[in-house]
Interface confidence: low
């Protein structure tokens, strides 16, 4: 159980990406921008990338930056699971993995991250602008969801290397220690953007939400920003979402887990489990859906399959105690 604010060292770029000099210049501003937008705030990161080998094949990687034990992960597309999204996969640490077409392979990468490969062919294949969401439920952190999509201008296989961000901690001192670096990074980012403003650059995806709910809602909500946390997702292009998937969902509870082989249930264990906690760097936006209850005039939360979330029995704080130590 980690008890202090930590800023993991930046990982080296993924193999095959470090060779392009010009690409590094392109990636750096987005790494910085991601840090500026998400530093110290989101609990979940999402990375969406299109495979260079199969242009219509997607890989979604998601991770949880909490310290508790993950009870369940739900991956959906077309928006958050409870807001019109369709479940692609459900991963349970002990009971195994269940996935629905076009999901081809869902797996645990570490104790706190998963990956999902989507099949590219057929009517149910995703579009480049499809939103993918990952919802992690753990004790004691609660439920956290983040969404991401491929930027319109992204080149296949060229998504930036996942970059660890500062972890949201109960102790603010560590985060404040990082803030100076981030401030410098943000200033440097603005400088870079001004220098390279003649270049077309990929954009973060503000269009996925309604105008009054900017991406900045990934920040830990203050009283003033709570309203933004509850703004429903705007409707996105649904032509990429299969109409038949909904019928495949199990309902009425987790009875379907019983049929899963137990050998499929194990996640990687050991000291490396927390070593790799990347966040999306290029184009994949991060959002956190924390206000999970219906307010006046809002829909009550609903998450699709009967067993989809294990939110926080404690309530608000994500990082306080040694409750869910693996």
């Amino acid at each position: 159980m980690r008890t202090e604010a930590q800023v993991p060292a930046l990982q080296p770029p993924e193999p095959g990406l470090e060779g392009a000099m010009g690409h590094r210049t392109l990636v750096l501003p987005w790494v910085l921008l991601t840090l500026c937008v998400t530093a110290g705030t989101p609990e979940v990161w999402v990375q969406v990338r299109m495979e260079a080998t199969e242009l219509s094949s997607f890989t979604i990687r998601c991770g949880f930056l909490g310290s508790g034990s993950i009870s369940l992960v739900t991956v959906s597309w077309g928006g958050p699971n409870g807001a019109g999204g369709t479940t692609l996969a459900v991963l349970h640490p002990e009971r195994g993995i269940r996935q629905w077409a076009p999901a081809r392979q869902a797996r645990w990468e570490t104790q706190s991250s998963i990956s999902l490969i989507l099949e590219g062919s057929g009517a149910s294949s995703p579009c480049a602008n499809t939103t993918f969401c990952c919802k992690f439920a753990s004790f004691p952190e609660g439920s956290w969801e983040a969404c991401g999509s491929l930027p319109p201008s992204s080149d296949p296989g060229l998504s930036a290397p996942p970059t660890p961000a500062p972890i949201l901690r109960a102790d603010l001192a560590g985060i404040l220690g990082v803030s100076g670096v981030l401030l410098f990074g943000c200033v440097y980012l603005l400088h870079l953007l001004r220098r390279h403003k003649h270049r077309p650059a990929p954009r973060l995806q503000p269009s996925r939400t309604s105008p009054q709910a900017p991406r900045a809602r990934a920040w830990a909500p203050s009283q003033a920003s709570q309203a933004a946390l509850h703004v429903p997702y705007a409707t996105i292009n649904t032509s990429c979402r299969p109409a038949t998937l909904d019928t495949a969902h199990p309902h009425g509870g987790p009875s379907w887990w019983a049929s899963l082989p137990t050998h499929a249930a194990h996640r990687p264990q050991g000291p490396a489990a927390w070593a790799s906690t990347p966040i999306p760097a290029r184009g994949s936006f991060v959002s956190v859906e924390n206000g999970l209850y219906a307010q006046a005039g809002e829909r009550p939360p609903h998450t699709g399959p009967g067993l989809t979330l294990f939110p926080d029995p404690r309530g608000p704080r994500a990082m306080e105690g040694p409750l869910g130590v693996r």
Partner: antibody, heavy 116, light 106 residues
Framework: QVQLQQSGAELARPGASVKMSCKAS????????MQWVKQRPGQGLEWIGA????????RDTQKFKGRATLTADRSSSTAYIQLSSLTSEDSAVYYC?????????WGQGTTLTVAS | QIVLTQSPAIMSASPGEKVTMTCSAS?????MHWYQQKSGASPKRWIY???KLTSGVPARFSGSGSGTSYSLTISNMEAEDAATYYC?????????FGGGTKLEIK
Amino acid sequence: QVQLQQSGAELARPGASVKMSCKASGYTFTDYWMQWVKQRPGQGLEWIGAIFPGNGETRDTQKFKGRATLTADRSSSTAYIQLSSLTSEDSAVYYCATFNNYLDYWGQGTTLTVAS
Amino acid sequence: QIVLTQSPAIMSASPGEKVTMTCSASSSVSYMHWYQQKSGASPKRWIYDTSKLTSGVPARFSGSGSGTSYSLTISNMEAEDAATYYCQQWISNPYTFGGGTKLEIK
């Protein structure tokens, strides 16, 4: 609208057991932990434990371990707490509560009176 | 077990008055949460993460503190604020509440 409707007042003898219920509506019952909190007359609040109805996973405190049993019925969206080996110290109002992040919902409470 | 001690146990304030109540923890906690409970009613979470107001809580309420010392402040007391306020920590099991501060209106 989220609602937690708790069962009515209970009167029990020392040494007996009692089972109180909390029926949830207005949200997906299986997706949220249900807490149980005790409040003795004129006193403060005491956290008993929590259950996740989706799989029956529970968290409890050492004080109530073995004596408080938390269960949930998904079909009726109802959570239960069973207290055994009752003593006068168990006379209290018992609240169920489901909360996550920025909002919380509580039942109206069930008053348990243990008397001979 | 972390013991939370609230003071004063009972206090009264006039409308418009500034009110501050404290919660002292027996060992350091990262965040404190506050609940409001009116007579005969269920508790409501009022402030979470030390200083964030739950939706619907008036802006005259504020929370602050760190380590072992936390406080809840009402900048301008109003009649509807009369209630008992409990602090709570979620850092270690058992997740203890303070004994409460009963705030009355003069």
